[in-house]
């Protein structure tokens, strides 16, 4: 049994890091493998992650972490029984993938303005809370070409757009994702999408 693709990990910079790797053949990850991880810190304790299958030869493990900060560095040991298959390290702050925003809501009761709001996925005491920026994707269910991205570079998790920038009488969907420049993160996954019917009064033409 050998590792074909070494584990690569990403952290949500809060409580979970996800590591994925591939073996050289079909593997029952949960029964045959264990990923041991330990913070390189005084008094830290070793933890064991039981991987799940991710395709025939692929494995994925969700590492639980407390109080993640930029100085943290973890040792990783991948074991098959008594055999050490791979040894490495992982610094969560250098491989951050933020959590996806939640609770995306479209408020259509403001006259001729669409207000989209969502929730910041981090608590106020997490460093990323004040450092996320967002991308909002709006698209038409009827017209695949009617697809747009709005970059939200301010901290408030909301976006106002004129309803007239979208077609009237058509159903639209929106979703939002986040990233943080400070840790050069990747984009989060998209939030679940929300749907609304866009209707507004056309201005009376003279």
């Amino acid at each position: 049994m050998k590792v074909l693709q070494e584990p690569t990990c990403v952290s949500d910079y809060m409580s979970i890091s996800t590591c994925e790797w591939k073996m050289n053949g079909p593997t029952n990850c949960s029964t045959e493998l264990r990923l041991l991880y330990q913070l390189v810190f005084l008094l830290s304790e070793a933890h064991t992650c039981i991987p799940e299958n991710n395709g025939g030869a692929g494995c994925v493990c969700h590492l639980l972490m407390d109080d993640v900060v930029s100085a943290d560095n973890y040792t990783l040991d991948l074991w098959a029984g008594q055999q050490l298959l791979w040894k490495g390290s992982f610094k969560p702050s250098e491989h951050v993938k933020p959590r996806a925003p939640g609770n995306l809501t479209v408020h259509t009761n403001v006259s001729d303005t669409l207000l989209l709001t969502w929730s910041n996925p981090y608590p106020p005491d997490n460093y990323l809370y004040n450092h996320l920026t967002y991308a909002v994707n709006i698209w038409s269910e009827n017209d695949p070409a009617d697809f747009r991205i709005y970059n939200v570079t301010y901290l408030e998790p909301s976006l106002r757009i004129a309803a007239s920038t979208l077609k009237s009488g058509i159903s639209y969907r929106a979703r939002v994702r986040a990233w943080a420049q400070c840790y050069n993160t990747t984009w989060s996954e998209w939030s679940p999408s929300t749907k609304w019917h866009n209707s507004y009064r056309e201005p009376f033409e003279q």
């Epitope: 005084l42 008094l43 304790e45 407390d66 109080d67 100085a71």
Partner: antibody, heavy 116, light 111 residues
């Protein structure tokens, strides 16, 4: 919100021991390390040691080795710092502080006076 | 005695800028991150800066930190009378054993 509530002031005689408590609330107790530091009157801060509330393991500053004991009670989310063989130089305010590499939150401090 | 050295006192007028230095060595500041604590008279210390330059939520951006080599600096702009306090730098040292030294402390007086 995070709160670290420390026990009240103590007056001790030289040679005696003192046990200071620090009750934590507002966060997952076993997820954060706890430090102890002290400050003698008119002096700076001095680090004493650290405890991992999850397993109870400890590490102490060399200066206090053999005289200090840090423990925790997970059922009450409380950490304790006991200092023995007290001398007048141990007169200080003793602080618990939550954190790992740095101290996020501090208790208000417990004044310990050592006097004959 | 502390292995992190700070000036005993600094002073400046309201609205001015002041900097406080913290000098250490290769086994602590040179190899770790620096934090800064503010201690108002008669109160417990409060975290002001961590990770060399990050502010906890609620700390105004008048406070900033930086690190270069084996020394660090705390800068306070737009000084206010309420900033009058003792300031301590802190870090951790892993050699020969893990310890968390604090700086000697600096008394800031707002004139």
């Amino acid at each position: 919100q995070v709160q670290l509530v420390q026990s009240g002031a103590e007056v001790k005689k030289p040679g005696a021991s003192v046990k200071v408590s620090c009750k934590a609330s507002g966060y997952a107790f076993t997820s954060y390390y706890m430090h102890w530091a002290r400050q003698a009157p008119g002096q700076g801060l001095e680090w004493m040691g650290i405890i991992n509330p999850s397993g109870g393991s400890t590490s102490y500053a060399q200066k206090f080795q053999g005289r200090v004991t840090m423990t925790r009670d997970t059922s009450t989310s409380t950490v304790y710092m006991e200092l023995s063989s007290l001398r007048s130089e141990d007169t200080a305010v003793y602080y618990c502080a939550r954190g790992k590499y740095w101290m996020y939150d501090w208790g208000k401090g417990t004044r310990v006076t050592v006097s004959s | 005695q502390s292995v992190l050295t700070q000036p005993p006192s600094v002073s400046a007028a309201p609205g001015q800028k002041v900097t406080i230095s913290c000098s250490g060595g290769s086994s602590n500041i040179g190899n770790s991150y620096v934090s800064w604590y503010q201690q108002l008279p008669g109160t417990a210390p409060k975290l002001l800066i961590y990770d060399n330059n990050k502010r906890p939520s609620g700390i105004p951006d008048r406070f900033s930190g930086s690190k270069s080599g084996t020394s660090a600096t705390l800068a306070i702009t737009g000084l206010q009378t309420g900033d009058e306090a003792d300031y301590y730098c802190g870090t951790w040292d892993t050699s020969p054993v893990w310890e968390w030294p604090f700086g000697t402390g600096t008394k800031l007086t707002v004139l």
